[in-house]
Interface confidence: low
């Protein structure tokens, strides 16, 4: 009898194929699309998740326009190139040899170019602002209760260290969650804020990436918190490089 569980699945990533071929006959899972072995005790990187999603493509979602210096994911879904650690490669290209540079969450941070485009390094997204609008409720949520519940969610569901949840702001009906994580702050084993934000985004949209868990049931003192709009802004350690035409558009 080996150490493999009867139910060989990946709790943190349903977009995997699993078999008991790991050490000691243990359950080991590989991401769809890339075939990379994933660590099912923590979140799978956004790059591998996007690649898996593209291996079973769905309709691309429409995303909002950027606001000021923050980046918003306008380009929707694409099939990314991931490095051996599952991170986004700094340069991404499509099948027609159009290339662009991305940040650590895979969002484009330069104008599109050709194969001669250089992306010297993967620029880290160190600040993520998740902007939510909740559905009308009888009254406003208590700010401190809301703050505690969202911090608990990121700690327990996404295993994000509490120190990376910088702030939770609330002005009914708008909730803003600030995630901050500099390169120097992120230790080995720490969940990346970009990955946590992506899992949260998918949870909010009712597209949970977790295996077999129910969808996200967010409650504040028993009152359901239902989100009707989500915007996510990404701020990089090095400002993005877009042409003036793009910035004034």
């Amino acid at each position: 009898h080996t150490a493999a569980q009867d139910n060989c699945t990946c709790p943190t990533n349903k977009m995997t194929v699993c078999s008991p071929d790991g050490p000691g006959g243990r359950c080991q899972c590989r991401a769809l699309g890339s075939g990379m072995a994933v660590d099912c005790s923590t979140l799978t990187s956004k790059c591998l998740l996007l690649k898996a999603r593209m291996s079973a493509p769905k309709n691309a979602r429409t995303l909002v326009r950027p606001s000021e210096h923050a980046l918003v994911d306008n380009d929707g879904l694409y099939d990314p190139d991931c490095d051996p650690e599952g991170r986004f490669k700094a340069r991404q290209c499509n099948q027609t040899s159009v290339c662009w540079c991305v940040n650590s969450v895979g969002v484009r941070r330069t104008d599109k170019g050709d194969l001669s485009l250089r992306c010297d390094e993967l620029v880290r997204t160190h600040h993520i602002l998740i902007d939510l609008r909740h559905r009308p409720t009888a009254g406003a949520f208590n700010h401190s209760d809301l703050d505690a519940e969202l911090r608990r969610l990121f700690r327990e569901r996404y295993r994000l260290h509490p120190k990376f949840v910088a702030a939770v702001h609330y002005e009914q009906p708008t909730i803003q969650i600030e995630l901050r994580q500099n390169t120097s702050q992120k230790a080995a084993g720490d969940v990346d804020i970009g990955d946590a934000a992506y899992y949260f985004e998918r949870d909010i949209k009712g597209e949970s990436l977790f295996q077999g868990r129910g969808g996200l049931d967010l409650r504040v003192r028993g009152e359901p918190l239902q989100v009707e709009r989500t915007l996510i802004y990404y701020l990089d350690e090095i400002p993005p490089k877009f042409s003036m035409k793009r910035l004034t558009a």
């Epitope: 009898h1 150490a3 009867d6 050490p23 359950c27 080991q28 072995a37 005790s41 080995a188 084993g189």
Partner: antibody, heavy 119, light 112 residues
């Protein structure tokens, strides 16, 4: 929050069967495995066995002939039985939750229960 | 079965000084697929259950002070306490989970 609590008789006679129960709360036994570990007084930790979330078990090869671990998911309980006990089985017995689907670490432990084997 | 050997058995270190505990496994604990080492470190104080400090050989559990760090790969691993505090007096255990589970014999850390 996640909690585990061991319970059972504190005194067992030699040659009899030691029976302990680990009652859990804050998580589902269909999602996480539960391990039994023991520690003789003044000595180190010894892993006894595991009840995986899928319902299968594995045991320490040195104890395999005497150990049975079972689960009652409706009661949120995992039970340990150790037969033909001797004084060498006197120990604090702990249950601990697997924090990973393939059993990489134990982040949550019960407080432990001391079992003495003596006539 | 995988055998885990810890050294030293006990260690006396002055407050503020570095404490280093070694753990050696009888076979490699590195999973080439996930590139993770199946090794954890625990701290146990008298009358208490063990507390998880480090998993995957070098990942610090949430809430564990950053003076605790784990390193190593394959068969040789180290737990380091960079600046020993009075509350760090305890017994430390390594544990493999590459093939089921085995604990090391423990290292008692005391203040010199």
């Amino acid at each position: 929050q996640v909690q585990l609590q061991e319970s059972g008789p504190g005194l067992v006679k030699p040659s009899e069967t030691l029976s302990l129960t680990c009652t859990v709360s804050g998580f589902s036994l269909t999602s996480y495995g539960v391990n039994w570990i023991r520690q003789p007084p003044g000595k180190g930790l010894e892993w006894i066995g595991v009840m995986w979330a899928g319902g299968s078990t594995n045991y320490n090869s040195a104890l395999m002939s005497r150990v049975t671990i079972s689960v009652d998911t409706s009661k949120n309980q995992v039970s340990l039985k150790l037969s033909s006990v001797t004084a060498a089985d006197t120990a604090v017995y702990y249950c601990a939750r697997d924090e990973n689907w393939d059993g990489a670490w134990f982040a949550y432990w019960g407080q432990g229960t001391l079992v003495t084997v003596s006539s | 079965d995988i055998v885990m050997t810890q050294s030293p058995d006990s260690l006396a270190v002055s407050l503020g000084e570095r404490a280093t505990i070694n753990c050696k496994s009888s076979q490699s604990l590195l999973n080439s697929g996930t590139r993770k080492n199946y090794l954890a470190w625990y701290q146990q104080k008298p009358g208490q259950p063990p507390k998880l400090l480090i998993y995957w050989a070098s990942s610090r559990e949430s809430g564990v002070p950053d003076r605790f760090s784990g390193s190593g790969s394959g068969t040789d691993f180290t737990l380091t306490i960079s600046s020993l505090q009075a509350e760090d007096v305890a017994v430390y255990y390594c544990k493999q989970s590459y093939n089921l589970f085995t604990f090391g014999g423990g290292t008692k850390v005391e203040i010199k």
